[in-house]
């Protein structure tokens, strides 16, 4: 099994308020087994945005077909963006367990929010 890499290709994304933001994340291996989660921010104050293991997350949809057994694309779309959504988003692989434990993080994608065009 190759060593898992988490690829967040976009260092930054800029979206107008009210629009949807697409945050890209792909993994290079299904191993170790465990869910993908997305967070805004880092450290103890980080905010959970999406957890593959549970839901729903009303404003978040996965971009690819995550029910495919071989799926390695965990990009998400966040709808109706507001200035409060600005921040750095991390795609993180967890290793299964009780509880699941963080295994590896992507480098992060900074989301900035532009004023809604008048």
């Amino acid at each position: 099994e190759e060593e898992l890499q988490i690829i967040q290709p976009d260092k930054s994304v800029s979206v107008a308020a009210g629009e949807s933001a697409i945050l890209h994340c792909t993994i290079t291996s299904l191993f170790p087994v465990g869910p993908i989660q997305w967070f805004r921010g880092a450290g103890p104050a980080r905010v959970l945005i999406y957890n593959q293991r549970q839901g729903p997350f009303p404003r978040v949809t996965t971009v690819s077909e995550t029910t495919k057994r071989e799926n390695m694309d965990f990009s998400i779309s966040i709808s109706n963006i507001t200035p409060a959504d600005a921040g750095t988003y991390y795609c993180i692989k967890f290793r299964k367990g009780s509880p699941d434990t963080e295994f590896k993080s992507g480098a992060g994608t900074e989301l900035s929010v532009r004023a809604k065009p008048s």
């Epitope: 191993f31 170790p32 593959q52 293991r53 029910t67 495919k68 299964k96 009780s98």
Partner: antibody, heavy 117, light 106 residues
Framework: DVQLVESGGGVVRPGESLRLSCAAS????????MSWVRQAPGKGLEWVAG???????YYSGSMKGRFTISRDNSKNTLYLQMNSLTAEDTAVYYC???????????WGLGTLVTVSS | ALTQPASVSANPGETVKITCSGG?????YGWHQQKSPGSAPVTVI????QRPPDIPSRFSGSASGSTTTLTITGVRAEDEAVYYC???????????FGAGTTLTVL
């Protein structure tokens, strides 16, 4: 409430074909992967095939080639086309909803397929 | 193949553990209850340790590597059934089941 109702079972002769259906309700069928699982008389559970929400298919090795899983998301219905049936295919066939990691959380009541000459 | 004992028995109120081995680190596990042959299975545990909302809290699951365990704390007469362990293997994209364990409540 999640409901899965299988139909299409019956008695067929060896070599014949049969198509099973599973009508789903109470959840977003088009967003969920689904599977067929069978149970021969006096035996345990055996996974037959699975299908992703968009139609990618996966089969147990022993079932590949003769069985075809499909779905119609507009009708909230899962199908299993079974060809060249043999006596060893006699079983109760269950449809099951898959979880995010391809285990099963809800099952139908099953439909009995009997292959006999 | 997943391996589980053919039968276990317990008195009402006791704690029952059913183990299932033969998986690997690439597996997730579930447990399914079948009260009579040919009746619809009921999932009591999925994703190693998750309980569906309608399943009593006396059912719990755990997993470590190649083994998963179903624990019934304070077993009741209505828990008498065949319990199947099931697994999904990420390395082969396939599901598998154990042969089933018959739980008898004395």
């Amino acid at each position: 409430d999640v409901q899965l109702v299988e139909s299409g079972g019956g008695v067929v002769r060896p070599g014949e074909s049969l198509r099973l259906s599973c009508a789903a309700s109470g959840f977003s069928f088009s967003s969920n992967a689904m599977s067929w699982v069978r149970q021969a008389p006096g035996k345990g559970l055996e996974w037959v095939a699975g299908i992703s929400a968009s139609g990618d298919t996966y089969y147990s090795g022993s079932m590949k080639g003769r069985f075809t899983i499909s779905r119609d998301n507009s009708k909230n219905t899962l199908y299993l086309q079974m060809n060249s049936l043999t006596a060893e295919d006699t079983a109760v066939y269950y449809c099951a909803r898959e979880t995010w990691n391809h285990l099963f959380d809800y099952w139908g009541l099953g439909t009995l397929v009997t292959v006999s000459s | 193949a997943l391996t589980q004992p053919a039968s276990v028995s317990a008195n009402p109120g006791e704690t029952v553990k059913i183990t299932c081995s033969g998986g690997s680190d690439s597996y997730y596990y579930g447990w399914h209850q079948q009260k009579s042959p040919g009746s619809a299975p009921v999932t009591v545990i999925y994703s190693d340790d998750q309980r569906p909302p309608d399943i009593p809290s006396r059912f719990s699951g755990s997993a470590s590597g190649s083994t998963t365990t179903l624990t019934i704390t304070g077993v009741r007469a209505e828990d008498e059934a065949v319990y199947y362990c099931g697994g999904y293997d990420y390395s082969t994209y396939t599901n598998t089941f154990g042969a089933g364990t018959t739980l008898t409540v004395l």
